[in-house]
């Protein structure tokens, strides 16, 4: 974490009411909130949505924003027709800039966008554009929820009436009606070009109180292909001071996002302060909590036909979702244990968001070596209730590979868990190599509170023509006081431990679509060990073939093609930047040429989704790997893990079996079912699909070992 | 009020095809999954079939090939269709509305059920 | 196929705890739901995912579930308790998905 004392107790920077009116006028309008005394807030902790009310006392009212819309109490409201928009075909000036709040990335318009109808009192004008997501892989992150469906992101666009104020922020501090209208974005399996210029701005925001210009962009492309369907209520604003002076409209279809493009929200960073520390954080999980209707009522559009839709819902989406192809986000919180010398026991939790409830089953996959070849098997789990399984017949000097995937009652399957890797000759549990770059220097390694997501590239080793991608598996990562999902961390380089990549592990993760067809031998193996490798802890981005794997991206993204990015003096932060990018630099070009290199001999792998095909560029990530937060921490004081042996390859192997828990007598009704199935639904859906966002204190996350039955042989 | 209510039951032919409706109010069929469940006098709960909220349909083995199952979303309604009737499918039929959570399904609201009697 | 097996009929007197139960023919797949049906009504949801209770259903229902069986318990059996009752559970994806009930137990409260 990047601590350093500030003056201020009271900082409010990032503080959305009051973005400025223009680029010249920021530096002074920051300065004027932190004398003003503005209250400073949070998304968590001790600032956080309960604590609102103290400082900004509208924040309690009863006709607060966001909340959950049940389709079927929405009253369908006559006066409640077609939009209309004037000015969102266009295309932005280059005047269009965007910020980093350190509460949300803001776009400030500077063109003449309006709306009218809708039920709108007037003509209103658009001012700004904010961003709401959550923390990773498509994890819910909207303010807004139809049917308790929550979304990736919310965009929403903020309007008032020119022809009663001056400016949108006369209209807030006088307490008089705006507009606001709120965009869901859903993953899709493919980037969405219009959104473009959008993440472009975001690789030059990364950092609290950045601005940068953006690229030209047409808002209209920002919106849902089909605005008639929408639900209206009157609200708040969904940050301090939570004013109650919002109409709202939420339009019901939302905008494709792909996973690659997500990462870009991922990746911002923001200030977090507590007492007279500041540190910085990720920006994740900017969303405020739901509020109580009360005695609202949520209408919806009477445009003609623009909620007839069934199957054909998203047919005017060409990038359909994500969701419509895959049953759930993957399996997460994956762990192997053994359970004795001949038998390891692998578990996992449910799914956090699952498209197509409910899942019946899971279908474990796994691979070892032999004679350099690799086997893979796959059997299904049955028991929803029981998430474990145990493979039993392991043979303790192989390398197993693990992977999991959740099908749903219409048969669909999830995108595959994150891929475990397990020598059993040990049991110690490797939690992944990282380094992490604090602002005093450790002595210890880095505690679990201390892994950071580095949200950028893998890399690949190379030896004797095999391409063996890894990626180390993230653990225990809980939410940091900011709600974010850890602390600030520098992407390292790290030699890497010996053998295949860890001294004395067990357990670590491939990018999901990168199965490798054969594992390094011994000697191929131990020839690396002196190698630089970039240890990545999270989903990578998504790049085409054409894209270099290793991270480009420096602290600041500047080569992503920030431009005119505005200078920041406040709070010695720009000093502290400066010593972070020398040191990042040679970490830079260190770790960019080890890739390089590697990618010089390496294939694209192969993909191994069931909605991927080679097509699609061989370097795509099936996004979803979560991070582990409950596997056991290993490292106990005065215990050294032994070394672990140099894979062998015995002719003696015997191919492990899988025994579900508590089962006896195989079940006829199942037969194996392959990993690589193909999709056999089509891939659309309704846009009203049911999808379960799991509370994850419901998750069965036990990790009690509990022995096989005898004999459940597959 | 969310409910739901059956109708197109009487007096069939053995070899007709019967059809039935189930109309819903109050909730979206976009949203929500419909089983259709039937009990013969005297017996239990035998389950049909079921329509998910994406439109895609499952059967009980024994019904398959002789039911169908649709819905037609902006009327609010979801049909049964099972040909070849003989008098072992006189029964009182039932549509329910499924609650779909994460790894389960029960069927949280039923309709009154509507007769179904099959005699030449 | 897939069996869920219910004692045909239980007895119980007035004020006393009856249990009822499920038994898979294999261990249970998926989480079990309990129906009470009343002569000439539509069957009411009791008990869903083994062991909770939809509102509205009285506190004196509860629901368990332990290997292949579940099992459903009345504690302070009423008159008004006097019914069919079905455990009901789901199986399979795809075109092997199914949704299984027992064949019933009738309750009868006496005294």
């Known amino acids: 974490v990047l601590h350093y004392v500030v003056c201020f107790p009271a900082l409010t920077e990032g503080y959305v009411g009051t973005l400025q009116e223009s680029r010249q006028d920021s530096s002074v309008q920051i300065r004027r909130r932190k004398a003003s005394g503005d209250p400073y807030w949070a998304y968590s902790g001790a600032y956080g949505p309960e604590h609102w009310v103290t400082s900004s006392v509208s924040c309690g009212g009863s006709h607060q924003s966001p909340i959950d819309i049940l389709d079927h109490h929405a009253r369908v409201g006559d006066e409640y027709q077609e939009l209309q928009l004037d000015g969102f075909d266009n295309e932005s000036s280059n005047k269009t800039w965007m910020k980093n709040t350190g509460k949300t990335v803001a776009i400030l318009l500077k063109d003449d966008y309006f709306v009218s109808g809708a039920g709108l009192p007037g003509r209103f004008k658009a001012e700004k554009v904010e961003f709401h997501w959550g923390h990773s892989n498509g994890s819910a992150g909207s303010e807004h929820s139809v049917n308790g469906r929550r979304f990736p992101v919310e965009m929403q666009i903020f309007f008032y009436n020119p022809d009663d104020f001056d400016s949108f922020q006369t209209a807030i501090s006088e307490n008089r009606i705006i507009g606001a209208m709120a965009i869901f974005f859903q993953v899709s399996p493919r980037d969405n070009s219009a959104l473009d210029p959008i993440i472009h701005g975001l690789k030059g925001v990364v950092h609290h109180e950045k601005e940068t210009f953006l690229d030209p962009f047409i808002l209209r492309d920002l919106l849902p292909a089909s605005l008639g369907s929408y639900y209206r209520y009157t609200g708040s604003l969904t940050t301090p001071p939570c004013s109650e002076i919002v109409e709202w409209i939420v339009f019901r279809r939302p905008v494709p996002i792909s996973y690659h493009q997500l990462e870009a929200f991922y990746s911002i960073f923001t200030t977090e302060q507590q007492d007279h520390v500041k540190s910085v954080e990720y920006l994740r999980n900017n969303f405020r909590p739901q509020q109580a209707l009360n005695d609202r009522v949520v209408s919806k559009s009477a445009v003609r036909d623009a909620w007839n839709h069934d199957l054909a819902d998203f047919l005017d989406n060409p990038l359909g979702t994500e969701a419509s192809k895959v049953c759930s986000s993957p399996p997460i919180h994956m762990k192997v244990q053994p359970l004795n010398q001949t038998a390891l026991q692998v578990s996992w939790s449910q799914p956090e968001t699952i498209y197509h409830p409910p899942i019946m089953n899971y279908m474990i996959s796994y691979s070892w070596t032999k004679n350099e070849d690799e086997k893979e098997k796959t059997f299904t789990k049955d028991s929803d209730k029981d998430l474990k399984a145990t493979i039993s017949h392991v043979s303790p000097d192989s390398l197993y590979l693990f992977r999991v995937q959740a099908v749903c009652r219409n048969d669909m399957r999830s995108d595959f868990s994150q891929t475990m890797l397990f020598q059993a000759n040990t049991t110690r549990i490797f939690q992944g190599t990282r380094i992490v770059k604090t602002g005093v220097p450790t002595a210890s390694p880095a505690s679990s509170a201390d892994m950071a997501p580095i949200s950028s590239g893998s890399s690949t080793w190379t030896s004797s023509g095999i391409p063996f991608s890894f990626v180390s598996m993230a653990t225990g990562m809980g939410p940091s006081s900011s709600g974010s999902q850890a602390t600030v961390a520098s992407v390292v380089t790290s030699t890497l431990l010996a053998g295949l990549g860890f001294g004395g592990g067990g357990i670590s993760s491939f990018p999901s679509t990168v199965w490798p067809t054969r594992l390094p031998t011994a000697s191929a193996a131990s020839k690396q060990a002196g190698r630089t490798v970039l240890a990545t802890t999270e989903a990578l981005a998504s790049p085409g073939p054409d894209v270099h794997s290793a991270p480009s991206k420096d602290s600041e993204g500047t080569e992503e093609g920030e431009k005119e990015e505005k200078s920041e003096s406040e709070d010695g932060e720009r000093e502290h930047e400066e010593e972070e990018k020398d040191s990042e630099k040679k970490e830079k070009s260190e770790a960019t040429h080890t890739a390089a290199e590697s990618d010089r001999t390496a294939p694209a792998p192969t993909p191994s989704s069931p909605h991927r095909t080679a097509a699609e560029g061989g370097h795509q990530t099936i996004p979803g790997r979560r991070q582990d937060h409950s596997a056991p921490a290993t490292d106990q004081p005065g215990h050294v893990a032994p070394d672990l042996d140099p894979l062998v390859d015995t002719a003696t192997q015997v191919p492990p079996t899988a025994t579900e828990e508590h089962y006896s007598g195989s079940d006829p009704r199942r037969p194996e079912m392959p990993s690589k199935k193909p999709m056999s639904r089509g891939d659309r859906f309704s846009e009203d699909s049911k999808f379960i966002t799991v509370n994850p204190a419901e998750k069965n996350t036990s990790g009690m070992l509990s022995r096989p039955s005898p004999g459940r042989m597959e | 009020q969310e409910q739901q209510k059956e109708s197109g039951g009487g007096l069939f032919k053995p070899t007709d095809t019967l059809t039935l409706t189930c109309t819903v109010s109050g909730f979206s069929l976009s949203s929500n999954a419909i089983s259709w469940v039937r009990q013969a006098p005297g017996n239990g709960l035998e389950w049909i079939g079921a329509?998910?909220?994406?439109?895609?349909?499952y059967y009980a083995t024994w019904a398959k090939g002789r039911s169908t199952i649709t819905r037609a979303t902006n009327l609010n309604t979801v049909t049964l269709k099972m040909t070849s009737v003989t008098a072992a499918d006189t029964a009182t039929y039932f549509c329910?509305?499924?609650?779909?959570?994460?790894?389960?399904?029960?069927?949280?609201?039923w309709g009154p059920g509507t007769l179904v009697t099959i005699s030449s | 196929s897939f069996v869920l097996t219910q004692p045909a009929s239980v007895q119980v007197n007035l004020g006393q705890t009856v249990s009822l139960t499920c038994t898979a023919d294999t261990l249970s797949r998926s989480y079990a739901s309990w129906y009470q049906q009343k002569p000439g009504q539509a069957p009411v949801l009791l008990i869903y995912r083994d062991t909770s209770r939809p509102s509205g259903v009285p506190d004196r229902f509860s629901g368990s579930s332990s290997g292949n069986t579940a099992t459903l318990t009345i504690s302070g059996a009423q008159a008004g308790d006097e019914a069919d009752y079905y455990c009901?559970?789901?199986?399979?994806?795809?075109?092997?998905?199914?949704?299984?009930f027992g064949g019933g137990t009738q309750l009868t409260v006496t005294g």
């Open positions: 329509i998910d909220n994406s439109g895609s349909a």
């Open positions: 009901a559970t789901s199986d399979g994806s795809g075109s092997s998905y199914q949704f299984v």
């Open positions: 329910a509305r499924e609650d779909v959570r994460a790894d389960s399904i029960d069927l949280n609201m």
